[in-house]
């Protein structure tokens, strides 16, 4: 802000003069600037116990410029507002208040949450996950041969991480027991990894052995993406008498 304080040079009528210094259009010895040159804003500057009129090219923090024909002034934002566009539209709130649609609020309205970094009320973001990827081949100790009972896994990705008040992410990993017809490992097949293990490593902090609650298990059974190829369906017939057990990872 470029400030100009007036000094009386030419007497116009008692206590008022023109031809002031800097940005003042009219001024007085006692009050400093009384009015400002075009495009400048009048403001009161406190000097000790006294307030002096000054002319500024832009208004200080906590004020906005009001323009009327040939008379501009710095006008105070509302008490809870740090910077504003006008009296009714705040652009930055004072500490302890959250900005929402130009207003400063103690608490954010229903359906919104406080972002303590930007000090704004923002929409609550719920977790979004992709559809399940296909089940991995049935494996045991990383091999797809030489056993009868093994496990198979499927995963899904987190598309949108939730905000503080958003719904938590559902499991992104599911593992269940599976049975295959025993077949001998061919030469070079020993220790062959399942396709899924090569394709995706567990997310950092994921526990492959975390067992979810029964609701998670039920929901995993109901997911329509559980498509299986014909070969897997044949294998599954052997399991009909056994209950399928799932192991999931929750985020």
């Amino acid at each position: 802000q470029n400030a100009s304080r007036g000094r009386r040079q030419r007497r116009m009528h008692p206590n008022v003069s023109q031809g002031c210094q800097g940005g003042c259009a009219t001024c007085s010895d006692y009050n400093g600037c009384l009015s400002c040159k075009p495009r400048l804003f009048f403001a009161l500057e406190r000097i000790g116990m006294k307030q002096i009129g000054v002319c500024l090219s832009s208004c200080p923090s906590g004020y906005y410029g009001t323009r009327y024909p040939d008379i501009n002034k710095c006008t105070k934002c509302k008490a809870d507002c740090d910077t504003c566009f006008n009296k009714n539209f705040c652009t930055k709130c004072k500490s302890g208040f959250y900005l929402h649609l130009g207003k400063c609020l103690d608490n954010c309205p229903e359906g919104l949450e406080a972002n303590n970094h930007t000090m704004e009320c923002v929409s609550i973001v719920h977790c979004e996950v992709s559809e399940w990827n296909p089940w991995s081949p049935c494996t045991k100790k990383g091999k797809t041969c030489g056993f009868k009972r093994g496990t198979e896994t499927r995963v899904r990705e987190i598309i949108q991480h939730p905000s503080a008040k958003g719904n938590l992410c559902p499991p992104t990993n599911e593992t269940r027991k599976c049975t295959v017809q025993r077949k001998k490992c061919q030469k070079g097949e020993r220790g062959k990894k399942g396709r899924e293990r090569k394709r995706k490593k567990p997310n950092k902090g994921e526990s492959k052995e975390a067992i979810p609650d029964s609701k998670s298990l039920e929901s995993s059974k109901e997911i329509p993406e559980q498509r299986e190829n014909k070969q897997q369906q044949k294998k599954r017939k052997v399991q009909d008498k056994q209950k399928s057990v799932s192991v999931s990872t929750v985020h």
Partner: antibody, heavy 119, light 107 residues
């Protein structure tokens, strides 16, 4: 000493236009802000608007469609026109001046002129 | 528009009394407030501007104070010539608005 004197007809018929002039002495209307204020009998003061040193005007939105403020710098006068008047416009009309936010607001006033709206 | 609520609307006082008149703005007016004295049949006279600055020639028994939304005019020792109607005016933004007035009468 700055002096302001209002002049104009004291009686105006309803639906007609009220016209008043403020003649200024002791200062030029090419500096400062020149205002109109009115006061209905026995009531409070109402701000009407101003004409600035450059001739730009501001009108109170409550009167905006009816009010015109103009000036004649050669005579050092400024004028008020208020159209489509009704009995509610009966008031004492004052002209007054100020020089900016840092000084006395309405430092100088005219003596006022009563305008009655009646048929 | 900013509303100015002045109180009381009238008061009775004796010479020598201390008189206080208040004006409350509907929002913060940042000290842009003036006080006027009006006697019957006369134009208003400016007493105080910018909340507490006395106009040249106004007796020092008149004083103004306040900030934000609340402002006060005080007459420390009422004199016979002070019986009149007093108005506040905000000029923080346009349109300017006056208080409804306070009539100070002799008790």
């Amino acid at each position: 000493e700055v002096q302001l004197v209002e002049s104009g007809p004291g009686l105006v018929k309803p639906s007609e236009t009220l016209s008043l002039t403020c003649t200024v002495s002791g200062d030029s209307i090419t500096s400062g802000y020149w205002n109109w204020i009115r006061q209905p009998p026995g009531k409070g003061l109402e701000y009407m608007g101003y004409i600035s040193y450059s001739g730009k005007t501001y009108q109170n939105p409550s009167l905006k469609s009816r009010i015109t403020i103009s000036r004649d710098t050669s005579k050092n006068q400024y004028s008020l026109k208020l159209s489509s008047v009704t009995a509610a416009d009966t008031a004492v009309y004052y002209c007054a001046t100020y020089y900016g936010y840092g000084g006395p607001w309405f430092a100088y006033w005219g003596q006022g002129t009563l305008v009655t709206v009646s048929s | 528009d900013i509303q100015m609520t002045q109180s009381p609307s009238s008061l009775s006082a004796s010479v020598g009394d201390r008189v206080t008149i208040t004006c409350k703005a509907s929002q913060d007016i940042d000290s842009y407030l003036s006080w006027y004295q009006q006697k019957p049949g006369k134009a208003p006279k400016t007493l105080i501007y910018l909340t507490n600055r006395l106009v040249d020639g106004v007796p020092s028994r008149f004083s103004g104070s306040g900030s934000g939304q609340d402002y006060t005019l005080t007459i420390s020792s009422l004199q016979p010539e002070d019986f009149a109607t007093y108005y506040c005016l905000h000029y923080d933004e346009f349109p300017l608005t006056f208080g409804q007035g306070t009539k100070v009468e002799i008790k």
